[in-house]
Amino acid sequence: ASNFDCCLRYTDRILHPKFIVGFTQQLANETCDINAVIFHTKKGLSVCANPKQTWVKLIVRRLSKKINKM
């Protein structure tokens, strides 16, 4: 759920890493209310996820490793 470029709340679903092509991080500031990881899926969707959740951290770590290898 996002308002323009800001995530307003987190998904209540768990996504598989195979579904995700990349991510961006949203930091809470004067523009956006919450910290979030925005996953970009193979279907072109942007999914707002809670950066504190284990499954989110795992995917971010996996994607970051991939990026660092390139």
Partner: antibody
Framework: QVQLQQPGAELVKPGASVKMSCKAS????????MHWVKQRPGQGLEWIGV????????TYNQKFKGKATLTVDTSSSTAYMQLSSLTSEDSAVYYC?????????????WGQGTSVTVSS | DIQMTQSPASLSASVGETVTITCGAS??????LNWYQRKQGKSPQLLIY???NLADGMSSRFSGSGSGRQYSLKISSLHPDDVATYYC?????????FGGGTKLEIK
């Protein structure tokens, strides 16, 4: 070795609640998810929901929201599922199963299942 | 939710034969598919994960293939011990959904 121990059976009255347990051993409890799966007699498998024991994060199949509540006690490495307002539709075998994101999010170990019978 | 459709619902084959079970998803699940084997009176067991990877302790007579929306499980040189119900499962996104199952019997 990895083991998930579940009580064999529960007999409960319609309208009542039941809380079933799943005691994990042989691995670090907080490093793996715990899923719950329902199987009615002669029918297929239905995913109820999952809990992450490291932070108690849960997500449910919409169909079971309000019916099932998943919790954990990390001190005893035990997962629990409470089912409320029971009807005959809830008579089934309920499995706890370890979710392993290291092997493609698969459920790699299963408990023996708790058979729940709802009857007056 | 992603729907999983398995076929056939049941099949009977002779010892030594090769059988194939198929599983179709209602949308692309990008290989996020697992197979389970459930023998009579027992709990399900992980058989194949990630569409193609054999789970620890399972016979190499089992193999998984497929991509996109279509997947299959092949059992070669059928053994009497293979009598079971086989389920596919989508793990792309919750809620995780199972196929209806394929009951395998020996002729």
């Amino acid at each position: 070795q990895v083991q998930l121990q579940q009580p064999g059976a529960e007999l409960v009255k319609p309208g009542a609640s039941v809380k079933m347990s799943c005691k994990a051993s042989g691995y670090t409890f907080t490093n793996y998810w715990m899923h719950w799966v329902k199987q009615r007699p002669g029918q297929g498998l239905e995913w109820i929901g999952v809990i992450d024991p490291s932070d108690s994060y849960t997500t449910y199949n919409q169909k079971f929201k309000g019916k099932a509540t998943l919790t954990v006690d990390t001190s005893s490495s035990t997962a629990y599922m409470q089912l409320s307002s029971l009807t005959s539709e809830d008579s089934a075998v309920y499995y706890c199963t370890r979710g392993n994101y290291g092997v493609d999010y698969a459920m790699d170990y299963w408990g023996q299942g708790t058979s729940v019978t709802v009857s007056s | 939710d992603i729907q999983m459709t398995q076929s056939p619902a049941s099949l009977s084959a002779s010892v030594g034969e090769t059988v194939t079970i198929t599983c179709g998803a209602s949308e692309n699940i990008y290989g996020a598919l697992n197979w389970y084997q459930r023998k009579q009176g027992k709990s399900p067991q992980l058989l194949i994960y990630g569409a193609t990877n054999l789970a620890d302790g399972m016979s190499s007579r089992f193999s998984g293939s497929g991509s996109g929306r279509q997947y299959s499980l092949k059992i070669s040189s059928l053994h009497p011990d293979d009598v079971a119900t086989y389920y596919c499962q989508n793990v792309l996104i919750t809620p995780y959904t199972f196929g209806g199952g394929t009951k395998l019997e020996i002729k």
